[in-house]
Amino acid sequence: NIDVCKLGTVTVQPAPVIPLGSAANISCSLNPKQGCSHYPSSNELILLKFVNDVLVENLHGKKVHDHTGHSSTFQVTNLSLGMTLFVCKLNCSNSQKKPPVPVCGVEISVGVAPEPPQNISCVQEGENGTVACSWNSGKVTYLKTNYTLQLSGPNNLTCQKQCFSDNRQNCNRLDLGINLSPDLAESRFIVRVTAINDLGNSSSLPHTFTFLDIVIPLPPWDIRINFLNASGSRGTLQWEDEGQVVLNQLRYQPLNSTSWNMVNATNAKGKYDLRDLRPFTEYEFQISSKLHLSGGSWSNWSESLRTRTPEEEPVGILDIWYMKQDIDYDRQQISLFWKSLNPSEARGKILHYQVTLQEVTKKTTLQNTTRHTSWTRVIPRTGAWTASVSAANSKGASAPTHINIVDLCGTGLLAPHQVSAKSENMDNILVTWQPPKKADSAVREYIVEWRALQPGSITKFPPHWLRIPPDNMSALISENIKPYICYEIRVHALSESQGGCSSIRGDSKHKAPVSGPHITAITEKKERLFISWTHIPFPEQRGCILHYRIYWKERDSTAQPELCEIQYRRSQNSHPISSLQPRVTYVLWMTAVTAAGESPQGNEREFCPQGKAN
């Protein structure tokens, strides 16, 4: 703390504010009758330099002038930008125990003259807003710098306002609080900014603008949409705008979209008809405004209006498939399946499906509605049947889709050839085939159908299918395809009134099975052994099983076991072997093989054949 300079004074030449790179002389003088009490000649004046309240230097060696015991002058150089504190202290050299006594102090500010302000920009937000201007101040001056914003305009009027920058605040924007009204649309305004500090002053170049240049309309508000006759594709967008607006920009998009539809509307007066909307779709609408057709700035976008367009009747046709199962000699069960319409076809919430099964001669018609995407009925095995399905929402129903019910695999001549299934990656399978060799009627389309080969899958899970045009011989199936699961894949060739099919198994990824089949029994019949087993549990198969292997060897033998490889068939769970010696005890076990390799062995069973063996 400096005790208000009771002992003396400190002065700075040329001034306490100096340009960067300049030197200054600091003089410290004692007041009369002040100093070391007994020996005035022993007065020693020292100068200490502080930056941010930290002592950084004793300037004892920088004395340029000395009146012993009365005053001293120090030269200071290389001062850094900002403020530096210098404190003069009195050291009474005969008294070593007493610390030097503060005499007085001074702050020297080092800075630069302001640069001319640049890039002046003025804006008035809305017709009732006020003019605010901002600018680029240029390099930091490190000194308190005053800025005067001066706006000159019509009626011989000049408006001005001031602010300052220092080490605590920056001044590069001022709101003049004055409103420019539309009656000044043709008037010109001139704005300039002047900067002044202790080292100099500078002025910006004058910047000229008009009302239209700077007034940015407020964004439109109170946006709403009215759908004409509850139409899902046509609506009138309405909004409120400032009075002088002549041009609007509208943008709208479905909520899940990434690109906007843009429309320019001249003299819309808060109203615009849209004709290309998608029914039953969540849309986002925004509007921007401009006060002049060619000049001026667009307003910010309005707040979004989010709304859903009304429903319209469904369009498009349902993709139908079916399964036939004979129940007994005169009845069959027909299960119809169909895929949901995509949203652009459904055009609303599908409330139900209208299903019709009709015998072609019109003797019998079964009709029903269902909320599900499948329908099962028992019908006579006689007659030619056709099915149709249509989807209904609150506005109406789609055109019915018809399909002829034929014996899907009844015609061998229509069976596709050389069907193969190759795994493409983790979640799809490429199915290829060749057309039927001797079809006596043209193939209208192929259906590729697939279902996981797991217990109860026929009853529990609907099939998945793809319709393929007659000139294509491949399909990439991916819907509900999971790795390490085996699928039964059927390729159907359909003509107008017949069907032929070929079947294959396939998987998208495989591993060796987790375990081998479990041998449940070994029985001897007519000099042959029958091995019975239970299949590997579905989750442990890890893909399509290609073969089972039955291994056997004499108990306690160290020889390699013999083996018999059986082509995998789901329906088969026993197999005969006939090369075992009677009255010799054997150990038997089984493994399973996928395209990825062989499983560990299943359980071991011992057996000693009794009868004669070949």
Epitope: N128, T130, G153, P154, N155, N156, L157, C159, Q160, K161, Q162, D175, L176, G177, I178, N179, L180, S181, D183, L184
Partner: nanobody
């Protein structure tokens, strides 16, 4: 009852200075513009300067720009007009006036937009 009371007028030589004061009472003028108008004999009342309290903006007519300076003391509800380098053509009765929002460029310099007026103080500049 709103009252505006001017003071500080008088006789001064060309090139001299005067400081006019206008004390407002009866309400606060924090959202107002307080201005000075003048009327020379046989002439229409003309705008001189104004201060927008809330924004801190000052307004001047071109003929006094650089010579006159307007300021205010919110605590005292008083506005001042410092007049330097006075000329003979500055001779007039000087009126203090106040206006309510909105504050439009078109309105600032026009006397009909000011709702409150003082009685005036005479300023005479002699050569």
């Amino acid at each position: 009852q709103v009252q505006l009371q001017e003071s500080g007028g008088g006789l001064v030589q060309t090139g001299g200075s005067l400081r006019l004061s206008c004390a407002a009472s009866g309400r606060t003028f924090s959202n107002s513009v307080m201005g000075w108008f003048r009327q020379a004999p046989g002439k229409e009342r003309e705008f001189v300067a104004a201060l927008m309290w809330s924004a801190g903006s000052e307004f001047y007519t071109d003929s006094v720009k650089g010579r006159f300076s307007i300021s205010g003391d919110g605590a005292k509800n008083t506005v001042y007009l410092q007049m330097n380098s006075l000329k003979a053509e500055d001779t007039a009765v000087y009126y203090c006036a106040a206006k309510n929002p909105p504050h439009r460029w078109s309105d600032i310099g026009k006397s009909p937009h000011y709702e409150y007026w003082g009685q005036g103080t005479q300023v005479t500049v002699s050569s």
